[in-house]
Structures are given as C-alpha cells and as structure tokens.
C-alpha cells in the first residue's frame, strides 16, 4: 500500500474577477481496488447515497474529476446499496479519473478496498484518514471550486502542474 | 433522455436586471456541476459562470460582481441572475452540465437583450 | 486571464480534404483544452475533451493533439455535416476561455 502524495488547489477570487490559487499537501493511501498512478482533476463531492442512483446509466458522461466520498458509520447504513468497491466503480464509470474515501469514520472499509481484486480499476482509489482527511474535508465543505492531483511520489515542487 | 431548458430571457434596459432559469431532467441534477455560456447570435462563445454540484462558484471577469449563478437541488434548477444589465450582454444564454468543462449536453439557449 | 488565440478564423475545404484547425496558449495548460462544434442554430458540440480524448459517439474521423501550448483539431477527411463553427475552450485556470472560433466552409 503506498503513499498517495495528494495536492489541493483552490481557487479564489478577488473582487476584480482575479483568481488566486491556495495550494494544500496531504497524505493518503494507494488501495489495491484501483491503480498506483497519478491523476488530476476538480473535486467534486459525493454522498455515498449519490453513487447509488441508477438513472444516470445512460449519460455520455464528462470525464477528468475527482469524486471525494466521505464514508458514514456502518451503522449508519447497515445495507448500502453497493460495497465501497462498489461505489468506486460507479464513480470510476461515470467518468471520475480518481476515487478518494474519507474513511475515518469507517475504518473497516480499508480492508474492503484492500482486498486483492482480480479486476482492479484502472483509475487510483485513495484512502486518507485522520488529520488528513479532516484537511481534506475541510477544503471541500468550503463549497470553493477545488483540484486535486494525486501522485504516488512527493511533488517537487508544490505549484509544479498548477501553473496559474 | 437528458434534457436542459433555458428560460427567462427577454428585453430589458440598460442597468435592468433578470434571472435566467435552466430546468434539468433526465439525470440526477445533484451530482453535477453547471455552467453558463452565452453567444451573441453568429458570434463566438462567451463563458459566463459556473457551480459545482455542492455550490462553489466561479465567474468570467466581465460579469464578477454582477450576475450571480445559484441551484436549487431540489427543484432541478440551475440559475442565473443577471443586475446592471449592459447592452454588451445582449446575447443567447446556454446553460451546460459538466465539472470543470461544459461536457456533452447543453441547452437550446434563451435570448437576453438589453437596449434603451 | 489566459489568452486563447484560435486559428484560422474561417476555412474553405473540399469534401474528403484533411482539415487542421490549432489553438495556441498563452500559457502552459497541460491537457486542459476541449474542442466543439457548433452548427447553425444550434447548442455547441463536445468533440474531444482534455485535448486528445474523443467524447463518445463523435466519428473517429476527429482527433486531437497537442504539443506544449499548440493545440490542434484535424478531420481526417472533411464530411458535408462537418460544415460548422469550431471553438476550443480552455478549462485550465479560471476565468476559463473559449477562442474566437473557426467557421469551415466548403470550397
């Protein structure tokens, strides 16, 4: 399982209309359930109940996002509709380019995801817990437009592909 | 079968205001982000706005401070509201799903113009 | 703001002719580019999307390539429905911004 080198970027905007960009660092982890490989694009925030929906099957989808799923207490939700795996691969069908799970509040999931798949996503499935995931999490309930890139070496340098 | 419809346009004076209205259907309007791109007939593409599915928000410059875009989930509705209306946002005004981009389904179009 | 300088502006074509249409940056970008179509009286297109990947149910005739800040759109061999407007749009760094447009006519 290795570390997945996570970069955020937000941007802000000034009152002239100018953005500015606000660069965060953080760690998680490479599952098994998907690829060791970088990949970049918007966060967009997903309620574990959102992945459940069927009525999107037939959509041309748009691609190149970063579905964030914060995962409840298994008591939460006794019978989800689909496993973590699961809802991996529905994010991943719908065109997200990378998965990460906050799975601080269900630790179990990482098993889950670590489970040796004989079919892997072809997209990184990340986990990140603690007080990464708390910075994480907190970026994205800031309801600002944000990008993540993930890499599974530290960045060189912090704005290195956010070249703004 | 997805489906965006763009309604609200209309003919205003300058320094007017409006608000555009986009109906979704078809998909679940919670789970994407929208944009706003406008056309001044058999011109070139503008981008004017766009929100993500959890309601962060960026504008082009032209109109910052001005319009402001806004979702109501539970109505499958994406808006736009358009104050101090200029004669140089006469346009034809799309609405688009997609996250960081206007992907493949966008709508017809509703007419703005602002003349005196 | 990033400037987006799309050219030609208008071309003429003959049926089965390779058509080339290029975007250039002002900029470094990466990928972030996307190519439409737009016919008249129409909503705009989604061909290609982060610059090289074609967006499902577009014919394979479309392609995209890039090379540091020089995007290009080809249509290996010019259709009578390829007749239309194209824009680039980059959605690299807001405020995003589309070129001026390429109107493809036919010769």
């Known amino acids: 399982k290795e570390t997945a080198f996570v970069e955020v970027v937000l941007f802000e905007s000034s009152p002239s209309g100018d953005y500015t960009t606000y660069t965060t660092g953080l760690t998680g982890r490479f599952s098994r359930a998907g690829a060791t490989l970088s990949a970049e694009g918007e966060i967009v925030q997903m309620h574990p109940l959102g992945l459940c929906n069927n009525n999107d099957e037939e959509d041309l989808y748009e691609y190149g996002w970063v579905g964030v799923v914060k995962l409840e207490q298994p008591e939460l939700d006794p019978k989800p509709c689909l496993t973590v795996l699961g809802k991996a691969k529905r994010a991943v069908q719908r065109g997200a380019t990378a998965v990460i799970f906050d799975v601080s509040e269900n630790p179990e999931a990482i098993d889950q995801l670590n489970q040796g798949s004989e079919d892997p996503l072809k997209r990184p499935v990340v986990y990140v817990k603690g007080a990464d995931a708390i910075k994480l999490m907190n970026i994205v309930n800031k309801q600002k437009v944000a990008r993540a890139r993930i890499q599974h070496r530290p960045p060189r340098q912090p704005t290195e592909y956010f070249d703004m | 079968e997805v489906q965006l419809v763009e309604s609200g346009g209309g003919l205003v004076q300058p320094g007017e205001s409006l608000k555009l209205s986009c109906s979704a259907s078809?998909?679940?309007?919670?789970?994407?982000?929208m944009h706003w791109i406008r056309q001044v007939p058999g011109k070139g593409l503008d981008w004017v706005a766009y929100i993500t599915n959890s309601g962060g928000s960026l504008y082009a410059a032209a109109v910052k401070g001005r319009f402001t875009i806004s979702r109501d989930n539970a109505k499958n509705t994406l808006y736009l509201e358009l104050t101090s209306l200029k004669p140089e946002d006469t346009a034809i005004y799309h609405c688009?799903?997609?996250?960081?981009?206007?992907?493949?389904?966008w709508g017809r179009g509703t007419l703005v113009t602002v003349s005196s | 703001d990033i400037q987006v300088t799309q050219s030609p502006s208008s071309l003429l074509a003959s049926l089965g002719e390779r058509v080339t249409i290029t975007c250039q940056t002002g900029q470094s970008i990466n990928n972030y580019l996307n190519w439409y179509q737009q016919r008249p009286g129409q909503a705009p297109l989604l061909l290609i999307y982060f610059a090289t990947s074609l967006q499902t149910g577009v014919p394979s005739r479309f392609s995209g390539q890039y090379s540091g800040r020089s995007f290009t759109l080809t249509i290996t061999s010019l259709e009578p429905e390829d007749i239309a407007n194209y824009f680039c749009l980059q959605h690299y760094s807001p405020p995003y911004t589309f070129g001026a447009g390429t109107k493809l006519e036919l010769r």
């Open positions: 688009a799903r997609g996250y960081s981009y206007p992907g493949p389904y």
């Open positions: 078809g998909f679940t309007f919670s789970n994407y982000g």
